[in-house]
C-alpha cells in the first residue's frame, strides 16, 4: 500500500520565497514520519526534511543548505522555503515515509511542482525611465 501525494503543478517564488503544500492520502496525526522535499527530475537533492514524532514539535533541517521550515496538517506538510535563487528554478517532489506504527509506508512518486524563482527587478527611477514600450 502506497500513500498518494498531491502537489500544485507550478508555483512562482516571488521575493525568493515560496510555500509548497504536500497533501497526502494518509492522516499523519499521532504518527512518526519523515517528510522531505527533493529537487530535480531525479530527486537527487534533498532540499528539506521535516521529522514528526507523535504530534510533538517538528524537527526541520537541510543537509543541502536550503532555508526551510515546515507546518503539519492532519494530512499535509507545508514546506516554507526562503532565500531561493533564480538558478534553483526546478521541479520539486514531496516524499513521505511513515515509520511508526507499523507497517512502514511511503508514497507513490508524485507529479512534482515546478517552482519558478523570479529574480528581484528594481523599478526604474522616475528620473531615468526604462525604455519605452511600443
Amino acid at each position: 500500500n502506497k500513500i498518494l501525494v498531491k502537489q500544485s503543478p507550478m508555483l512562482v517564488a516571488y521575493d525568493n520565497a515560496v510555500n509548497l503544500s504536500c497533501k497526502y492520502s494518509y492522516n499523519l496525526f499521532s504518527r512518526e514520519f519523515r517528510a522531505s522535499l527533493h529537487k530535480g527530475l531525479d530527486s537527487a537533492v534533498e532540499v528539506c526534511v521535516v521529522y514528526g514524532n507523535y504530534s510533538q514539535q517538528l524537527q526541520v533541517y537541510s543537509k543541502t543548505g536550503f532555508n526551510c521550515d515546515g507546518k503539519l496538517g492532519n494530512e499535509s506538510v507545508t514546506f516554507y522555503l526562503q532565500n531561493l535563487y533564480v538558478n534553483q528554478t526546478d521541479i520539486y517532489f514531496c516524499k513521505i515515509e511513515v515509520m511508526y506504527p507499523p507497517p512502514y509506508l511511503d508514497n507513490e512518486k508524485s507529479n512534482g511542482t515546478i517552482i519558478h524563482v523570479k529574480g528581484k527587478h528594481l523599478c526604474p527611477s522616475p528620473l531615468f525611465p526604462g525604455p519605452s514600450k511600443p
Epitope: Q57, V60, Y61, F66, D69, Q82, N83
Partner: antibody, heavy 120, light 107 residues
C-alpha cells in the same frame, strides 16, 4: 524596550544536563522566531538552535542535534534550551536572540548571555 | 556550510580615521549578509543587514556594501565607542554562519 535575559548557566560535568531559560519583554514574543547562539574563544559565534513563532517547529545545528531541545512558552514569554549529554566542547556563553518570522536568521536583538562550563 | 573569512584579524587605528573591514564568503550569499559589533562583556549588536541597510538606531558613519562573495563594512570616522570586535554573518544558506571577527583597536 526589547529585552532578552538568559539564565540557568553554570558548571556541569561531562554527560550531565542543564536547562537554560530566556525571559523576553518589550515586544510581542509570539510573533518572533527565537534562537540560541553560542560563543567560545576558539570557535567564535556559532548558531545552535531555533524555534518558530508558535513553537511547532525547531532546527538544531548538527553538533547538538539529538542532545539539545529548544522549546518556548508564549504565555510566559520564555524560551528554553534543554541540554543533555553535555560535552567539554559545549562550554560557551549562550545567547538568546530573536529574528522576525519573515527574515528567519537576521538577529536584531540579543540577550547578555549565560556561561555554561562543562568540566570534570 | 558557508565559511566567512574576515580580514584583517586586527585593525589598529586612531579616532577620526576611516576603518574598512572585509568579509569574504566561500560561495555567493547574494546580499544576505549582516554585520554585528561586540564590545567586551557585551552581546553582539546588529549594525547592518542585507549587506547595506543600517539597523535601527545605528549612526550614519557605519555603512555596508558588497554582494555575492565580497563585502565591506566602513566606519567613516572612528569614534572612541567604535573600538570593538566586528562580525559578519550570512543567512543565505542554512545553517547561518559567522565570520571569525575583526578587532578594531586604538593605535
Amino acid at each position: 524596550e526589547v529585552q532578552l535575559v538568559e539564565s540557568g548557566g553554570g558548571l556541569v560535568q561531562p554527560g550531565g544536563s542543564l536547562r537554560l531559560s530566556c525571559a523576553a519583554s518589550g515586544f510581542t514574543f509570539s510573533s518572533y522566531w527565537i534562537h540560541w547562539v553560542r560563543q567560545t574563544p576558539g570557535k567564535g559565534l556559532v548558531w545552535v538552535s531555533r524555534i518558530n513563532s508558535d513553537g511547532s517547529s525547531a532546527s538544531h545545528a548538527d553538533s547538538v542535534r539529538g542532545r539539545f531541545t529548544i522549546s518556548r512558552h508564549n504565555a510566559k514569554n520564555t524560551l528554553y534550551l534543554q541540554m543533555n549529554s553535555l560535552r567539554a566542547e559545549d562550554t560557551a556563553v549562550y545567547y538568546c536572540t530573536r529574528s522576525d518570522s519573515s527574515t528567519w536568521y537576521k538577529f536584531d536583538y540579543w540577550g547578555q548571555g549565560t556561561l555554561v562550563t562543562v568540566s570534570s | 556550510e558557508i565559511v566567512l573569512t574576515q580580514s584583517p584579524a586586527t585593525l589598529s587605528l586612531s579616532p577620526g580615521e576611516r576603518a574598512t573591514l572585509s568579509c569574504r564568503a566561500s560561495q555567493s550569499v547574494s546580499s544576505y549578509l549582516a554585520w554585528y559589533q561586540q564590545k567586551p562583556g557585551q552581546a553582539p549588536r546588529l549594525l547592518i543587514y542585507d549587506a547595506s541597510n543600517r539597523a535601527t538606531g545605528i549612526p550614519a558613519r557605519f555603512s555596508g556594501s558588497g554582494s555575492g562573495t565580497d563585502f565591506t563594512l566602513t566606519i567613516s570616522s572612528l569614534e572612541p565607542e567604535d573600538f570593538a570586535v566586528y562580525y559578519c554573518q550570512q543567512r543565505s544558506n542554512w545553517p547561518p554562519t559567522f565570520g571569525q571577527g575583526t578587532k578594531v583597536e586604538i593605535k
